[in-house]
Amino acid sequence: KFSKQSWGLENEALIVRCPRQGKPSYTVDWYYSQTNKSIPTQERNRVFASGQLLKFLPAAVADSGIYTCIVRSPTFNRTGYANVTIYKKQSDCNVPDYLMYSTVSGSEKNSKIYCPTIDLYNWTAPLEWFKNCQALQGSRYRAHKSFLVIDNVMTEDAGDYTCKFIHNENGANYSVTATRSFTVKDEQGFSLFPVIGAPAQNEIKEVEIGKNANLTCSACFGKGTQFLAAVLWQLNGTKITDFGEPRIQQEEGQNQSFSNGLACLDMVLRIADVKEEDLLLQYDCLALNLHGLRRHTVRLSRKNPIDHHS
């Protein structure tokens, strides 16, 4: 319970707080657990204790290990443990899982990404922010105090965000980076009774006998990815797959997300070599989801050839 994992990168500053809390007036002693050796408090040392804080300025891979802190008061002693791991810097852009701080979620209303652990450091603005290793540029991104604000959050904003800042200790500067994942939660996700955009109800579609014809059934179901939403065609009330006419096939169109964020689906009905008997069929565009089913009916009519002899 009173053990805390801390991690950092070699040649960066790392500051660790004792997991046991006490009044500022209480003394805190730090030890390297494996050797029980006391950590010095003199700031000239690369690793030194400063009250509740243990400072690695800068950290080295060899510093990895368990550190013990003992909070001493006139009436009691409290012991805590800091499990410190220092990693070598990665040559590539990828930030491994073990260097990640907790994932945060944002939405259109709330898109703050706090820089992890920054409150332990003596830093001055500005804070630099990177997404998937690329420096963030553009007016949508605002570094504000210890957090990043993203305006008009979109699902594409999800990813790994790294904050970079400088810790100052007695005039010496040390770099610190920290990375966390940001996921976008669409608080406005909802589902609607299906709305068929095309075809219009009881539409008459003109086709030419012997030519190919396409009919598109397009419907919207709400915002965000939809649960159990579908569009399909029926011929005379029968599924295309059961109708048994190889000339008539349905093909899934593109899943669409329009600018207003609505989730829409397309299904294209392809009729090859249109025949007279196709004009007698009833074509139903069906859109269904959890709220129910909407049906628009289409009929085909023969396109009159242009009379050139009039």
């Epitope: 996700g189 909802f190 589902s191 609607l192 009774f193 649960f227 159990l228 959890l290 709220h291 129910g292």
Partner: antibody, heavy 116, light 107 residues
Framework: QVQLVQSGAEVKKPGSSVKVSCKAS????????ISWVRQAPGQGLEWMGW????????NYAQKFQGRVTMTRDTSTSTVYMELSSLRSEDTAVYYC?????????WGQGTLVTVSS | DIQMTQSPSSLSASVGDRVTITCRAS??????LDWYQQKPGKAPKLLIS???NLGSGVPSRFSGSGSGTDFTLTISSLQPEDFATYYC?????????FGGGTKVEIK
């Protein structure tokens, strides 16, 4: 933040009925559907059906047709699942779950024990 | 009904291990597959929707992939809190169906 709160555990006799409630808060009630999923002791998850909070449209898994009834009360943002002709194999935890983009929010579950 | 076959039904792993769970559908389900995590005595929790979209607050060590009939849930570095049972769910066609579950236990 959407929350689904279910009614408490029930002990029922074989042949009787049980009615489990699921009260929703946060979000717009009519903007989603509520699914019911059950889990017998030590078993996996089993879909029972759903009800649209928007219009009351229901769809029941074939296994439960004729025995299950799902209803809604828009004034209290509550949905109900009633299962009749109970038998010992209906002993399970019954969950309600919001079904919009996935089963993204779940109730805490209601244990229904059927025993003579 | 579409059958969802999950494998393995159980596995033992250590903290830090990479874990892969697969789910196979008896017919194509496009991208309409979710993954759920359930801990003893608790309700399931949405982990991943639409094959690869991480649920709210789900750590990035979880990832999903696949299409059509074969899908995979991967935990890149297993953590103590990840020991649980995992279920896949298809919602391409009615009725939605769950996989049988995969119990991830401590080795």
């Amino acid at each position: 933040q959407v929350q689904l709160v279910q009614s408490g555990a029930e002990v029922k006799k074989p042949g009787s009925s049980v009615k489990v409630s699921c009260k929703a808060s946060g979000g717009t009630f009519s903007n989603y559907a509520i699914s019911w999923v059950r889990q017998a002791p030590g078993q996996g998850l089993e879909w029972m059906g759903w009800i649209s909070a928007y219009n009351g449209n229901t769809n029941y898994a074939q296994k439960f047709q004729g025995r299950v009834t799902m209803t809604r009360d828009t004034s209290t943002s509550t949905v109900y699942m009633e299962l009749s002709s109970l038998r010992s194999e209906d002993t399970a935890v019954y969950y309600c779950a919001r079904s919009t983009n996935a089963l993204d929010y779940w109730g805490q579950g209601t244990l229904v024990t059927v025993s003579s | 009904d579409i059958q969802m076959t999950q494998s393995p039904s159980s596995l033992s792993a250590s903290v830090g291990d990479r874990v892969t769970i697969t789910c196979r559908a008896s017919q194509g389900i496009r991208s309409n597959l979710d993954w759920y995590q359930q801990k003893p005595g608790k309700a399931p929790k949405l982990l991943i929707s639409i094959v690869s979209n991480l649920g709210s607050g789900v750590p990035s060590r979880f990832s999903g992939s696949g299409s059509g009939t074969d899908f995979t849930l991967t935990i890149s570095s297993l953590q103590p809190e990840d020991f649980a049972t995992y279920y896949c769910l298809q919602h391409n066609s009615n009725p939605p169906t769950f996989g049988g579950g995969t119990k991830v236990e401590i080795k």
